[in-house]
Amino acid sequence: MATKAVCVLKGDGPVQGIINFEQKESNGPVKVWGSIKGLTEGLHGFHVHEFGDNTAGCTSAGPHFNPLSRKHGGPKDEERHVGDLGNVTADKDGVADVSIEDSVISLSGDHCIIGRTLVVHEKADDLGKGGNEESTKTGNAGSRLACGVIGIAQ
């Protein structure tokens, strides 16, 4: 089983970053950390999408990774996609320092995110509380600013 993974986020223009993943035990939480730069100040949706396909850039990554066929939510919600990691927050310099611990994603098994695409979005994720249909699918996070396929790391 892989215990570490990494993702290089690449986008149109200034948005780019590197995100690391570590899971010490197969059923344990995954630590997610790294940095994304070139963002506008504020909250940006942060999700694992289903496909590790970047043929058309971030467009071809498909919907949020959702093997349990649930509605979109926040990372602390029972009702959420596996890929729902909430928001990252960019400071006034456009840098988001990411530090997340999540117990739903995994680096092995049915919830494995390796080979899928990590996406940072244009707008804040409303965590499924937006009151419209789009909120229950995407959190109204808007377009995909940067993305990368999550790969095994040493």
Epitope: K10, G11, D12, G13, V15, F51, G52, D53, N54, T55, A56, G57, C58, T59, S60, G62, P63, S143, R144, L145, A146, V149
Partner: antibody, heavy 119, light 110 residues
Framework: EVQLVQSGGGLVQPGRSLRLSCAAS????????MHWVRQAPGKGLEWVSG????????GYADSVKGRFTISRDNVKNTLYLQMNNLRVEDTAVYYC????????????WGPGTLVTVSS | LPVLTQPPSASGTPGQRVTISCSGS????????VYWYQQLPGTAPKLLIF???QRPSGVPDRFSGSKSGTSASLAISGLRSDDEADYYC???????????FGGGTKLTVL
């Protein structure tokens, strides 16, 4: 100047091969997925193939799978399409393109190059 | 056959409003953004609408896009003779892992 310059088209017999090239300039080529789109005479546009910025993801239309190969050289800022076992129905103007997408607001198309497959 | 369905032709007189439809499925229009291109004879396509309803700078506000469910439409108001062209809708298809185009609509200004 931001542009895509295409070369490599021409007349070829069925079953033969041809390689198209598309040289990019004026923008960070290695930031973008790139594509080939074709248009048969008097017909509509058809996506042929696409390749991610780092060649990690590649896709083809069913009509060309197994015969065409897309590749890129980010040092030379060039996109390629190797076309083997060409058929009469492959006759078209081939465009290389940075297509509009989630993160591409300003697309860019090459001028197109005509490939004619005929005996 | 094209995955996205457009009427082959549309027409209108100068000053009129014309709408071009584009019908798809849940794996393309239903899941992803729609783009509209204009193609004048002998030239490469030009982007008119991105992300369903956004206009790139330089495209007049006479052009507007909308999307509902698995269908999209392009509206052109204040029709002009230089709007005579072919119009294509495009979307990424998650099932096919491909960009899919409509068959194109030839717009004639009478």
């Amino acid at each position: 100047e931001v542009q895509l310059v295409q070369s490599g088209g021409g007349l070829v017999q069925p079953g033969r091969s041809l390689r198209l090239s598309c040289a990019a300039s004026g923008f960070p080529f290695d930031d973008y997925a790139m594509h080939w789109v074709r248009q048969a005479p008097g017909k509509g546009l058809e996506w042929v193939s696409g390749i991610s910025w780092n060649s990690g993801s590649i896709g083809y239309a069913d009509s060309v799978k197994g015969r065409f190969t897309i590749s890129r050289d980010n040092v030379k800022n060039t996109l390629y399409l190797q076309m083997n076992n060409l058929r009469v129905e492959d006759t078209a103007v081939y465009y290389c393109a940075k297509l509009a997408g989630d993160i591409v607001v300003i697309p860019l198309w090459g001028p197109g190059t005509l490939v004619t497959v005929s005996s | 056959l094209p995955v996205l369905t457009q009427p082959p032709s549309a027409s209108g007189t100068p000053g009129q409003r014309v709408t071009i439809s584009c019908s798809g499925s849940s794996s393309n229009i239903g899941s992803n953004y729609v783009y509209w291109y204009q193609q004048l004879p002998g030239t490469a396509p030009k982007l008119l609408i991105f992300r369903n309803n956004q206009r790139p700078s330089g495209v007049p506000d006479r052009f507007s896009g909308s999307k509902s469910g698995t269908s999209a439409s392009l509206a052109i108001s204040g029709l002009r003779s230089d709007d005579e062209a072919d119009y294509y809708c495009v979307a990424w298809d998650d099932s096919l892992s491909a960009w899919v185009f409509g068959g194109g609509t030839k717009l004639t200004v009478l």
